[in-house]
């Protein structure tokens, strides 16, 4: 579809500021009108964009999910960032929730990393240093964590 | 993952109408801007109109305006395309694609899902 094919049908609240695109695209903060003559701004706390683009609507913000806090509101140029609650963390390979961080390692291994809102606590074999990942078993001597508290920010969108 | 699940494609009559349904199972798509495309035989995908996260902006191919209304309803997780005054040149397969946003000109923007296609032919 070429880019003529393309007409006005844009409808944009009222207080929406408009300007013109730069080389057919629009700033961050704005998405292009569908005849693309106009940037349209994006409506704050609502959506956002983040780069210079040609986009037809802006992305909607995301909401930061129960156990989680949010460490920055969404503006028309930034998502929400969202962290995982004290005591839990978020995987890279199931970023769509918090888990609880273990409280303790198993028998024969020393905590060497605190419990963060992006990992887990982190167990070593006491003798050979080996990290060790995956379910704690039935703890026996645990090493309890405090968790820990520096932010990191994890933003999803979506 | 999101799945897209379409119906309500057939066989009509040019001047007729038709409503297409497209559902989303697996996760919600309230938080995707909604789109619709469709292909003939050795064309390229074409799009064919698009609706915000929220339902409150909509962009359409030229060829449809005036004709056709997408529309979505995020309780029930679905989006509509209703096409009236249909032509013969509507026959298409068309799909429904979910995605961040699109772009000017039709192309999905970041995270996109597509659905498995349904089939209008619009006859003489």
């Known amino acids: 579809i070429t880019q003529q094919d393309l007409a006005p049908q844009q409808r944009a609240a009222p207080q929406q500021k408009r300007s013109s695109p730069s080389e057919g695209l629009c700033p961050p903060g704005h998405h292009i009108s569908e005849d693309g003559r106009d940037c349209i701004s994006c409506k704050y706390g609502q959506d956002y964009s983040t780069h210079w683009n040609d986009l037809l609507f802006c992305l909607r913000c995301t909401r930061c999910d129960s156990g989680e806090v949010e460490l920055s509101p969404c503006t028309t140029t930034r998502n929400t960032v969202c962290q995982c609650e004290e005591g839990t963390f978020r995987e890279e390979d199931s970023p769509e929730m918090c888990r609880k961080c273990r409280t303790g390692c198993p028998r024969g291994m020393v905590k060497v990393g605190d419990c963060t809102p992006w990992s887990d606590i982190e167990c070593v074999h006491k003798e050979s240093g080996t990290k060790h990942s995956g379910e704690v078993p039935a703890v026996e001597e645990t090493v309890t964590s405090s968790p820990g508290t520096p932010a990191s920010p994890c933003s999803l969108s979506g | 993952q999101v799945q897209l699940v379409q119906s309500g494609g057939g066989l009509v009559q040019a001047g007729g109408s038709l409503r297409l349904t497209c559902t989303a199972s697996?996760?919600?798509?309230?938080?995707?801007?909604m789109g619709w495309f469709r292909q003939t035989p050795g064309k390229d995908r074409e799009f064919v109109a698009a609706?915000?996260?929220?339902?409150?902006?909509?962009s359409y191919a030229d060829s449809v305006r005036g004709r056709f209304t997408i529309s979505r309803d995020n309780t029930r997780n679905t989006v509509y395309l209703q096409m009236d005054s249909l032509k013969r040149e509507d026959t298409a397969v068309y799909y429904c694609?979910?995605?961040?946003?699109?772009?000017?000109?039709?192309?999905?923007?970041?995270?996109?899902?597509w659905g498995q296609g349904t089939q209008v032919t619009v006859s003489s």
């Open positions: 694609a979910a995605a961040q946003s699109f772009r000017r000109g039709g192309a999905p923007y970041g995270d996109n899902y």
């Open positions: 697996g996760r919600t798509v309230s938080n995707y801007a």
């Open positions: 609706l915000n996260w929220s339902g409150d902006t909509t």
